[in-house]
């Protein structure tokens, strides 16, 4: 059978009392249940204690009373009674709140920001809030906008709420600035400040600065790093997906660099620590803002283990004719990781023997050839950390014109 | 305590121009709009425009947008609506009115009495 | 625009008794932020209009509790419960959900 909503001992949907007097609430339900307090209150442990107890006839019900003593103006807020354990289907109907103004003569705005003011970020067309709520829903407040405007509510595209502040419904270029809330509470007249930052949500570019595809061993850890270009104005949320995800097998640590004077680059770092099978396959970088939505992906080979494959391009025994400008003596190789390369001429280092020799990856070029050119050229490859070893040998001819 | 003052009555020839006033009192001038209406004889009212006093920003009913003119002087807490070229289907009751959409208000507007504005020769 | 309609007169009702007006929009009032901007006006004899209910169900400030608003998006009812003397006048629904403010032509109460 439906639970009955939690009852809360102060009626209404609303409740004034004076800042330095204690509130007293009580909860009474039919179940186990939960307080749900402003920011503020839940921080103090000094002036706010809970006690529980059976109550009702025979003790059937439960009954929650919360105490805060010395209340203050910023304890101002939603004060709610909760069940606890109930299907979210049911929320609704059993959750008891009220509103608790805390009048503070000295303090008409919950939260004061009269020097440095906040900043709100906004964008065009969505709501916005200024969000200088009251201690009393009886304390006259005015919006201006710097340096003469006042933005006067309309009850539509404008809106005072006391709980919040002025609701704004579609923003505009004209709410971008400083905007003031101001009260005059006794004579004294107080001020709270934000400014708007209009917030775009272009993306300029998006990049996985690593490789593409990746390559690793078995057991290595991958790092990718996706960068996200935007105007200076505009946020932007970074998610990556990959094909081990539902084991939250990633760590991913973000971070903004704000240094250039014309963009924003947002860095976000994926780490997985021992690579295996499982984590092989297409890893995405996401960026979102607000509408606008940009993609980057790189694949991931993970490999057992290290290897070097070798073989002739064409076929073992090469020609060429002397005074030939270049020649490029090149192997096909696969290998993971990259191993170091050296040529060998006749046994001996090629590049050390002349000048003339270069390695170019897996080839040597021999500039300017000439006759002393032709013997046999090995290839050494090896991947020293995983104590592989490969190597193979061609033979050039030289002809002479 | 909130008044909105008008005058009584106008009289003015057709094709003449009229400058009506507004002065406020009571509350900061600043802080609301002032919106004008009219009411010709027997008949119900028209919402004509309204002036935000702060910056002088006015909307008007597409209807009234070549026939009115709205302004304000801060300094007077006062506020002005030009009707120009005036024939016999001008000739109504313009009031002024300070709507107040605040909770603390609990949304109260305050209207002037009104001005009687005869157009004729 | 939008276009408010009223009848021109109520019935005519008995002092101490209830009294009803309506009123039709030509489209629905209510807003995607949940409020209805339905305005109801009593002009009295000789005065200016005076603001009754705001945002269809809303008593504006001073303003007795026998007069009660309800209504869906399009049709609309004012109430008073209690008709005394000085109600007596024109009762006028206007909109303010799309420039311009739009009013209807006025119900005339008639007492007995």
């Known amino acids: 059978s439906k639970l009955k909503d939690p009852e809360l001992s102060l009626k209404g949907t609303q409740h004034i009392m004076q800042a330095g007097q204690t509130l007293h609430l009580q909860c009474r339900g039919e179940a186990a249940h939960k307080w749900s307090l402003p920011e503020m209150v839940s921080k103090e442990s000094e002036r706010l204690s809970i006690t529980k107890s059976a109550c009702g006839r025979n003790g059937k019900q439960f009954c929650s009373t919360l105490t805060l003593n010395t209340a203050q103006a910023n304890h101002t807020g939603f004060y709610s009674c909760k069940y606890l354990a109930v299907p979210t289907s049911k929320k609704k109907e059993t959750e008891s709140a009220i509103y608790i103004f805390i009048s503070d003569t000295g303090r008409p705005f919950v939260e004061m920001y009269s020097e440095i003011p906040e900043i709100i970020h906004m964008t065009e067309g969505r709501e916005l809030v200024i969000p200088c709520r009251v201690t009393s829903p009886n304390i006259t407040v005015t919006l201006k906008k710097f340096p003469l405007d006042t933005l006067i509510p309309d009850g539509k595209r404008i809106i005072w709420d006391s709980r919040k502040g002025f609701i704004i419904s579609n923003a505009t270029y004209k709410e971008i600035g400083l905007l003031t809330c101001e009260a005059t509470v006794n004579g004294h007249l107080y001020k709270t400040n934000y400014l708007t930052h209009r917030q775009t949500n272009t993306i300029i570019d998006v990049q996985i600065s690593t490789p593409r595809p990746v390559k690793l061993l078995r057991g290595h850890t991958l790092v990718l790093n996706c960068t996200a270009t935007t105007p200076l104005n505009t946020r932007v949320q970074m998610t990556w997906s990959y094909p081990d995800e539902k084991n939250k097998r990633a760590s991913v640590r973000r971070r903004i660099d704000q240094s250039n004077s014309h963009a924003n680059i947002f860095y976000s770092v994926l780490t997985i620590d021992k690579m295996q099978n499982k984590d092989k396959g297409l890893y995405t970088c996401r960026v979102r803002s607000g509408p606008s939505f940009k993609s980057v992906n790189t694949s991931v080979h993970i490999y057992d283990k290290a290897f070097i494959t070798v073989k002739h391009r064409k076929q073992q025994v090469l020609e060429t004719v002397a005074g030939k400008r270049s020649y490029r003596l090149s192997m096909k190789v696969k290998a993971f990781p990259s191993p170091e390369v050296v040529w060998l001429k006749d046994g001996l280092p090629a590049t050390e023997k002349s000048a003339r020799y270069l390695t170019r990856g897996y080839s040597l070029i021999i500039k300017d050839v000439t006759e002393e050119d032709a013997g046999n050229y090995t290839i050494l490859l090896s991947i020293k950390q995983s104590n592989v070893f490969k190597n193979l040998t061609a033979t050039l001819i030289v002809n002479v014109k | 305590q909130v008044q909105l003052q008008q005058p009584g009555a106008e009289l003015v020839k057709p094709g003449a121009s009229v400058k009506l006033f507004c002065k406020a009192s009571?509350?900061?001038?600043?802080?609301?709009?002032i919106y004008w209406m009219r009411q010709r004889p027997g008949k119900g009212l028209e919402w004509i425009g309204e002036i935000n006093p702060s910056n002088g920003d006015t909307t008007f009913n597409e209807k009234f947008k070549t026939k009115a003119t709205l302004t304000v002087d801060k300094s007077s807490s006062t506020a002005y609506m030009q009707l120009s070229s005036l024939t016999s289907e001008d000739s109504a009751v313009y009031y002024c009115?300070?709507?107040?959409?605040?909770?603390?208000?609990?949304?109260?507007?305050?209207w002037g009495q009104g001005t009687s504005v005869t157009v004729s020769s | 625009d939008i276009v408010m309609t009223q009848a021109a007169f109520s019935n005519p009702v008995t002092l101490g008794t209830s009294a009803s007006i309506s009123c039709r929009s030509s489209?629905?009032?209510?807003?995607?932020?949940?409020?209805?901007?339905l305005y109801w006006y009593l002009q009295k004899p000789g005065q200016s209009p005076q603001l009754l209910i705001y945002?269809?169900?809303n008593l504006a400030s001073g303003v007795p509790d026998r007069f009660s608003s309800s209504g869906s998006g399009t049709d609309f009812t004012l109430r008073i419960s209690r008709v005394e003397a000085e109600d007596v006048g024109v009762y006028y629904c206007?909109?303010?959900?799309?420039?311009?403010?739009?009013f209807g032509e006025g119900t005339k109460l008639e007492i007995k």
């Open positions: 945002q269809m169900s």
């Open positions: 206007a909109q303010n959900l799309e420039l311009p403010w739009t």
């Open positions: 009115t300070r709507p107040s959409f605040y909770s603390y208000d609990y949304y109260k507007d305050y």
């Open positions: 489209k629905s009032l209510l807003h995607s932020n949940g409020i209805t901007y």
């Open positions: 009571g509350y900061t001038f600043t802080n609301y709009y």
